[in-house]
């Protein structure tokens, strides 16, 4: 659990100003899930401030790691049956601190606000939210005060009275061994599981749950997850592939086959198709990690967010590792770097995604007047003379392949190559051998190596061109 | 650097539609939004709507009527069409990359002026 | 829509002073998803700001930006002659985005 700079976020910030040091406090708000209010409204489920609370001494400019959380926890207590669904703002405040602290002594860091599904009783949620540069880790979950339990906490528990059992009538309390449900004040047969009540002889359903007694989920029979009643019902069976199949009703919503198609009934706060839709506007800010909120045309209908790249999810809440979705092509190496996807080409390509084949002439020319020549599915730069390397980028050493025969000396020139030949010698690269009874030069035997005098080549070859 | 480049028409007739094209050098049009927005000569910054690789897009509710915007990945390009003009559209129209921390615009094109007149 | 109310429209300043400019927006603006934008006469707008106080890339430390809810600042400690130029907020929390009008901070 930490609040500090998002990744990719550039130097890490400490949360202080100038003016010295500085607390960090976070305000927990709970509101009704379906809250039409304006974000400001009071957290009519309740609210609750962080309490010992560290203190920060970095100063700007400094690098501040990820900060801790204060210690403890902040405990919301909430009144009557918790509702299962509602809305979670949590703001980071800074508390300016010392003598010359000058200005407002408190400013607000950072806020989140997220509408949340959860029961009570279960495991920590985590979550990761993102607000301008600020990062905030948090963990939360639900819990009843004795003698409340149940999803809703509507359901009481008592202490036994005997050591072994529960009195007449009366079922031990899940999860509390050592307790007894108390005696019901909600209408007899009211699910324990699925109902509550907030006065006396009545059954209040949780969503997902309908009847009288809340004992039916919200489809058309009593067998959950599209399963059909069995014979004489022995139990439930599992049918063919049915168009309920995966329950495409999402946020909790029950699903139910009508004539070959299905039909959602949704929990409160959501309607559509798939109960897809919010009752949360863009008033509201829903939508996390720098997402954009898209309403209807009128400021009560539903929002959708865009998500930048690199997040998902109907509120832009879940990271993409969007290196899974192998953007770089032939074989580059994915770097995900937050803010931009980079790509590390492997020899050959290149292009931010790696799509352009150095190996194909349609890519780049070859440099210096060289000539593209494709063939065997590769490419190969034929370069003009004095050039080489793979794209002829390279001035090239004409007399690195010892051109020159039979101890001819090999000098680079502007128009490629001249050989000084060994006495004895003569042509482009020394190949023919001169015969001294002046008969025509025949290509001769390769002999070894023999040094030549530069100044002999120089004047015979002036004096074979006069 | 990634850069963009606006092209098309500086001038258009009233009541015909007016056609931008926007080139993406030294980076690919995936994974990026990219939009379009507008300034009208000595006036603010107006924005138009933008697009994603996937092909969601978001306009300006008040030209959503007149206005497509669609993107070409094998060109590296997106394009903008704003149909029955008047003199009101005249304006600087730029392409922008959207930011990948939220939706504000990191990279701009340089503008192309655009006159709707007869 | 969210409409953004800039202010002053014109501020006319000497290199080496400070300056505030202000931004108002008709309703809350979510997670300080608010932009500024520099913008010189002949040339494309710059993004200076994004969340409200982060600075992009490239940006020098003379600038900043705070605020949230409904009033954010942009201030430029000492202002350089080359800081002359219109500004710009932009709203990116709710669609449709939205810019301010603008301010100038001209030469005085």
């Known amino acids: 659990h930490s609040f500090g700079p998002g990744p990719g976020l550039g130097t890490p910030r400490s949360p202080c100003n100038a003016r010295g040091p500085c607390r960090l406090f976070f305000r927990v708000c709970l509101k009704p899930g379906v809250s039409q209010e304006a974000t400001e409204s009071l957290c009519a489920l309740g609210a609750a401030l962080s309490t010992s609370v560290p203190v920060y001494t970095e100063h700007p400019g400094e690098s501040a790691a990820a900060l801790p959380l204060p210690d403890g926890l902040v405990r919301v207590p909430f009144r009557d049956a918790w509702p299962g669904t509602f809305s979670l703002v949590i703001e980071t405040w800074r508390e300016q601190l010392g003598e010359h602290a000058g200005g407002p002594a408190w400013n607000l860091l950072a806020r989140v606000v997220g509408r949340r599904r959860l029961a009570a009783g279960g495991p920590w949620a985590r979550d990761v939210q993102r607000t301008g540069t600020w990062e905030l880790h948090f963990s939360y979950r639900a819990r009843c005060e004795p003698p409340a339990v149940g999803a809703a906490c509507a359901r009481l528990c008592r202490s036994r009275s005997a050591p072994s059992r529960c009195g007449p009538g009366l079922r031990p309390c899940t999860p509390f061994p050592d307790e007894c449900e108390a005696p019901s004040v909600c209408r007899p047969g009211c699910s324990p599981e699925h109902g509550y009540c907030e006065e006396p002889d009545e059954c209040r359903c949780l969503e997902g749950w309908t009847g009288p007694l809340c004992t039916v989920p919200v489809s058309t029979s009593s067998c959950l997850n599209s399963r059909v009643p069995g014979p004489a019902s022995t139990g439930c069976l599992l049918p063919g592939p049915g168009p309920c199949d995966g329950n495409p009703c999402a946020n909790g919503g029950s699903c139910s086959e009508t004539s070959g198609s299905f039909e959602c009934a949704c929990p409160r706060g959501f309607y559509g198709l798939r109960c897809e839709v919010s009752g949360v506007t863009c008033a509201d800010g829903p939508c996390f990690n720098g997402g954009l909120c898209v309403g209807g045309e009128d400021p009560d209908s539903a929002y959708v967010c865009h998500c930048p790249p690199g997040f998902q999810g109907s509120n832009c809440e879940k990271r993409v590792d969007r290196c899974s979705l192998q953007p770089c092509q032939n074989g580059g190496l994915c770097l995900d770097l937050g803010h931009a996807l980079r790509c590390r080409c492997r020899a050959g390509f290149a292009g931010p995604r790696c799509e352009h084949d150095l190996d194909d002439c349609a890519g780049r020319a070859c440099a210096n007047g060289g000539t593209c020549v494709e063939g065997g599915g590769s490419r190969r730069c034929s370069c003009a003379l004095g050039f080489g390397g793979r794209d002829c980028r390279e001035r090239a050493d004409p007399c690195a392949s010892r051109p020159c025969a039979h101890g001819g000396r090999c000098y680079a020139h502007f128009s490629g190559l001249v050989c000084a030949c060994a006495p004895g010698y003569m042509g482009v690269r020394c190949e023919f051998a001169v015969r001294p009874d002046g008969a025509d030069a025949v290509p001769a035997a390769p002999r070894g190596l023999r040094q030549a005098d530069p100044q002999r080549f120089l004047h015979h070859h002036h004096h074979h061109h006069h | 650097q990634v850069q963009l480049q606006e092209s098309g028409p500086g001038l258009v007739k009233p009541s015909e539609t007016l056609s931008l094209t926007c080139t993406v050098s030294?980076?690919?049009?995936?994974?990026?939004?990219w939009s379009w927005i507008r300034q009208p000569p000595g006036k603010g910054l107006e924005w138009i709507g933008y697009?994603?690789?996937?092909?969601?897009?978001n306009h300006n509710p008040s030209l959503k009527s007149r206005l497509t915007i669609s993107l070409d990945k094998a060109k590296n390009q997106f394009s903008l069409r704003l149909s029955s003009v008047t003199a009101a559209d005249t304006a600087v129209y730029y392409c922008?990359?959207?930011?990948?921390?939220?939706?504000?615009?990191?990279?701009w094109g340089q503008g192309t002026m655009v006159t709707v007149s007869s | 829509e969210i409409v953004l109310t800039q202010s002053p429209g014109t501020l006319s300043l000497s290199p080496g002073e400070r300056a505030t400019l202000s931004c108002r927006a008709s309703?809350?603006?979510?997670?300080?998803?608010l932009a500024w934008y520099q913008q010189k006469p002949g040339q494309a707008p710059r993004l200076l700001i994004y969340?409200?106080?982060s600075r992009a890339t490239g940006i020098p430390d003379r600038f900043t930006g705070s605020g949230s809810g409904t009033d954010f600042t942009l201030t430029i400690s000492r202002l350089e002659p080359e800081d002359f130029a219109v500004y710009y907020c932009?709203?990116?929390?709710?669609?449709?985005?939205?810019f301010g009008g603008g301010t100038k901070v001209e030469i005085n």
């Open positions: 309703q809350r603006i979510s997670r300080t998803y």
């Open positions: 030294d980076d690919s049009i995936s994974n990026y939004y």
């Open positions: 969340g409200a106080s």
């Open positions: 932009q709203q990116y929390g709710t669609s449709p985005l939205t």
């Open positions: 697009i994603f690789y996937s092909g969601t897009t």
């Open positions: 922008a990359r959207v930011f990948n921390w939220g939706f504000a615009f990191d990279i």
